[in-house]
Interface confidence: low
């Protein structure tokens, strides 16, 4: 069936439309286009004869139409009048006619709309505002946007006049937003510039900050007032009802008790004509003197001297408080407070008592703190430590030893090598060492205030080849299921790998085995008798690898539940009873026997010759391990038949 399709159906003025023909019959003579829904010679636009390929304009031809060989018709530069129906008349070669009708609609391109308002400065909770979208256009749809969102649902928002007018009833400050309108028709959509609604409101009840109402004499009073308001509020300050100034902030330096009173902030909005006030009551307290600490001993000696700290000045009916290290006083027998808490005494000071110490005086408003006081406790020197802890060094490296001893005042240091004084410094540095630098290195620390000296000696060996290592142990006889043992591979050397073997095998994976200290220390937790093995450590560096002699762990265990043998419990009268008791234990346990609860002998074997029914009863073997402190026993019933 012959059909006409309009592309597009809705056409904008000035654009073009194509009337596209579908299912055009075969064997045509020609065809004509007419304006309207029927064939009318007066309304012919154009005719076309296929044989001659000749197009002939008709009375309705405007010069804007182009006919194509496939019978489609293009109309350019569309005007409003072009809206409507178009009929195609097809004449076939057999002179049989066929007709088809198509249509399109013409719409104008919309102009950019604008918003008019009936009230440019509405007052909150009082006025309404009507926005109207201009111009009024036929066949146009009107839409509204608030802050680029579609209109919210609200009983205070109402659309009218075909949605061209948006009315906001009883405006609030929250209606201060960006409003836009949009016009749409089938061929165009245009959005207006935004209009910002300026809602007049306030002032709200002002807030005065800061909130605190208590001040000390000598401080500055700086009050700030703020009230939500549009346009911004004008502020006035009143003290005890008397006008002070028209500013948002009130500043009074170096206040006294006389500045106590009621402070009123008044906020005024000139556009709404409204006033709001807020009152705060300020109290100014007299300033007490700042406390300070005095001491009866400025340089106490550790473990010798006591120190009494006193909080000054002395004021009647005052509470004194103390702090050490910014904490309240710890409970300690070495800390004593006087009855009025004004004096704090430290008995037998230690280096940890340095402080800082603060005292405080409490008044109605706050606590006044003294400046902190630090005690200069004289101590030391302790035994010096030489670092690093390595004892073996490779030739060619630099030897840098540092000595430190805890001391106040700081210790003075001296270094000796093989008993010969070298230098009076904390650090000893020897570059590019050789085997000849091996020897005894002594650090001496001296405290000039106490006159005390302490020394530490370290043996240093310079060698490319590591020595054969050895194993040291922190527990030579650990108890099973109780003790831990830490094996350490000696010596400690720079850039060295430490390895361990147990019974010639690498370490088994076990939660009870832990390597630490760069694998130099092997710790066995909760030892068991199965840990009584041969332990070997190995050391490696870039030039050598050596293993220690094995160390066998001697685990103390037991005694386990003893076993009495032979297992027989029935004997014939006249036989010899020979009971042997055995309990797994390290060291071997002490054995004792009881027959029917009566102690017998302290031997492993109990022998009774020629037993009789009188020997019936309970035979108990008791075992005791003095090293583990543990005991065990077992009871066996013996029956002798006549």
């Amino acid at each position: 069936k012959l059909t006409i399709e309009s592309t597009p159906f809705n056409v904008a003025e000035g654009k073009e439309v194509l009337l596209l023909v579908h299912n055009l019959p075969q064997h045509l003579f020609g065809y004509s286009w007419y304006k309207g829904e029927r064939v009318d010679g007066n309304r012919q636009i154009i005719g076309y004869v296929i044989g001659t390929q000749q197009a002939t304009p008709g009375p309705a031809y405007s010069g804007r139409e182009i006919i194509y060989p496939n019978a489609s018709l293009l109309i350019q530069n569309i005007i409003q009048n072009d809206t409507g129906f178009y009929t195609l008349h097809v004449i076939k070669s057999d002179l049989v006619n066929e007709e088809a009708t198509g249509q399109f609609r013409v719409y104008p391109e919309l102009p950019k709309p604008s918003i008019s308002s009936n009230n440019s400065k509405p007052v909150e909770d009082k006025d309404a505002v009507a926005f109207t979208c201009e111009p009024e256009t036929q066949d146009a749809t009107y839409l509204w946007w608030v802050n680029n969102q579609s209109l919210p649902v609200s009983p205070r928002l109402q659309l009218s006049n075909g949605n061209r007018t948006l009315t906001l009833f009883n405006v609030t400050r929250n209606d201060t937003a960006s409003y836009k309108c949009e016009t749409q028709n089938p061929v165009s959509a245009r959005r207006s510039d935004s209009v910002i609604l300026n809602v007049l409101y306030g002032p709200d009840a002002p807030t005065i900050s800061p909130l605190n109402t208590s001040y000390r004499s000598g401080e500055n009073l700086n009050l700030s007032c703020h009230a939500a308001s549009n346009p911004p509020a004008q502020y006035s300050w009143f003290v005890n009802g008397t006008f002070q100034q028209s500013t948002q902030e009130l500043f009074i330096p170096n206040i006294t008790v006389n500045n106590s009173g009621s402070y009123t902030c008044q906020a005024h909005n000139s556009d709404t004509g409204l006033n709001r006030t807020t009152v705060t009551t300020i109290t100014v307290y007299a300033e007490p003197p700042k406390p300070f600490i005095t001491s009866n001993n400025s340089n106490p000696v550790e473990d010798e001297d006591a120190v009494a700290l006193t909080c000054e000045p002395e004021i009647q009916n005052t509470t004194y408080l103390w702090w050490v290290n910014n904490q309240s006083l710890p409970v300690s027998p070495r800390l004593q407070l006087s009855n009025d808490n004004r004096t704090l005494t430290l008995l037998s000071v230690t280096r940890n008592d340095v402080g800082p110490y603060e005292c405080g005086i409490q008044n109605e408003l706050s606590v006044d703190h003294s400046d902190p006081v630090i005690l200069n406790v004289l101590y030391g020197p302790d035994d010096p430590t030489i670092s690093p802890s390595y004892t073996y060094y490779r030739p060619g490296v630099n030897l840098s030893l540092s000595c430190h001893a805890a001391s106040n005042p700081p210790a003075q240091y001296s270094w000796l090598i093989d008993g010969n004084i070298q230098q009076h410094t904390q650090e000893l540095f020897i570059s590019n060492i050789t085997e000849k630098n091996s020897g005894l290195y002594t650090c001496q620390a001296n405290n000039s205030a106490s006159g005390h000296s302490r020394t530490t000696v370290k043996t240093i060996t310079v060698s490319a080849e590591l020595p054969k290592p050895s194993i040291s142990s922190n527990n030579s006889k650990p108890v099973e299921d109780k003790d831990a043992v830490a094996f350490t591979c000696e010596p400690e050397a720079q850039n060295t790998t430490y390895l361990w073997w147990v019974n010639g095998q690498s370490l088994p994976v076990s939660p009870r085995l832990q390597l630490s200290n760069g694998n130099r220390t092997l710790t066995l937790f909760n030892v068991t008798r199965n840990d009584a093995r041969a332990y070997v450590c190995g050391i490696q560096n870039s030039v050598s690898a050596n293993r220690s002699d094995p160390v066998t762990l001697d685990v103390l265990y037991g005694p386990d539940t003893p076993i009495i043998s032979p297992p027989d419990s029935s004997y014939l009268s006249g036989a010899n009873l020979n009971l042997s008791c055995h309990s797994a234990s390290n060291p071997s346990p002490q054995y004792s026997w009881r027959i029917n609860g009566i102690p017998q002998q302290h031997t492993q074997v109990l022998f009774i010759a020629k037993i009789t029914p009188n020997n019936n009863g309970t035979y108990a073997c008791f075992v005791s391990n003095l090293a583990t402190g543990r005991n065990n026993s077992i009871v066996k019933s013996i029956t002798v038949s006549a």
């Epitope: 490319a464 390895l499 690498s506 190995g538 490696q540 030039v543 050598s544 690898a545």
Partner: antibody, heavy 120, light 106 residues
Framework: QVKLQQSGAELVKSGGSVKLSCTAS????????MHWLRQGPEQGLEWIGW????????EYAPKFQGKATFTTDTSSNTAYLQLSSLTSEDTAVYYC?????????????WGQGTTVTVSS | ENVLTQSPAIMSASPGEKVTITCSAS?????MHWFQQKPGTSPKLVIY???NLASGVPARFSGSGSGTSYSLTISRMEAEDAATYYC?????????FGAGTKLELK
């Protein structure tokens, strides 16, 4: 007994990357160092570096810094070598080796090698 | 890095003949290791820490040297000894190898 099984030969385009694997049996790689080396066609041996599978510590030869990345998966006892930005000069047989910690650090056990060919 | 120079690069020896391969280091090393590689196979350790024979290596192989000069000796060449031999140092990083000595059977 100890065995190091390496992944199969790889043909890679220039600029690409490849990840080689080395699966150990007969020992736990956490107890050892895993070294990687390579040997170009008709060339000598080059040491790429090592990884300590126990803690992930690595040491790379300066030449292979940024080119090679070592990783391990101790659960599968496998070491990996990732090579990136490959060029024709990276065409070589890549070996993994176990550096035993029971003596000095020498190479005891070698994988069979993985041939990597970089084509342009 | 420590450069190891091997000599000769190629040599041939008759069965029963004594073979010596030398390795010179650009910096002093504590020990030298020696590897043997046959075509299509992975290298195999023959001597470690200058003079120690690796497991399964025949006693005709020996090593010596100190400082910067080291050598590998085969007391009596056998057919199965034909291979390329590499020296290797592990005193400093990066670990380095010599360029190799190809030993052929005459």
């Amino acid at each position: 007994q100890v065995k190091l099984q390496q992944s199969g030969a790889e043909l890679v385009k220039s600029g690409g990357s490849v990840k080689l694997s080395c699966t150990a049996s007969g020992f736990n790689i956490k107890d050892s160092y895993m070294h990687w080396l390579r040997q170009g066609p008709e060339q000598g041996l080059e040491w790429i570096g090592w990884i300590d599978p126990e803690n992930g510590d690595t040491e790379y030869a300066p030449k292979f810094q940024g080119k090679a990345t070592f990783t391990t998966d101790t659960s599968s006892n496998t070491a990996y070598l990732q090579l990136s930005s490959l060029t024709s000069e990276d065409t070589a047989v890549y070996y993994c080796n176990e550096g035993t910690p029971t003596g000095p650090y020498y190479f005891d056990y070698w994988g069979q090698g993985t041939t990597v060919t970089v084509s342009s | 890095e420590n450069v190891l120079t091997q000599s000769p690069a190629i040599m041939s020896a008759s069965p029963g003949e004594k073979v010596t391969i030398t390795c010179s280091a650009s910096s002093s090393v504590s020990y030298m290791h020696w590897f043997q590689q046959k075509p299509g196979t992975s290298p195999k350790l023959v001597i470690y820490s200058t003079s120690n024979l690796a497991s399964g290596v025949p006693a005709r192989f020996s090593g010596s040297g100190s400082g910067t000069s080291y050598s590998l000796t085969i007391s009596r060449m056998e057919a199965e000894d034909a291979a390329t031999y590499y020296c290797q140092q592990r005193s400093s990083y990066p670990l380095t190898f010599g360029a190799g000595t190809k030993l052929e059977l005459k």
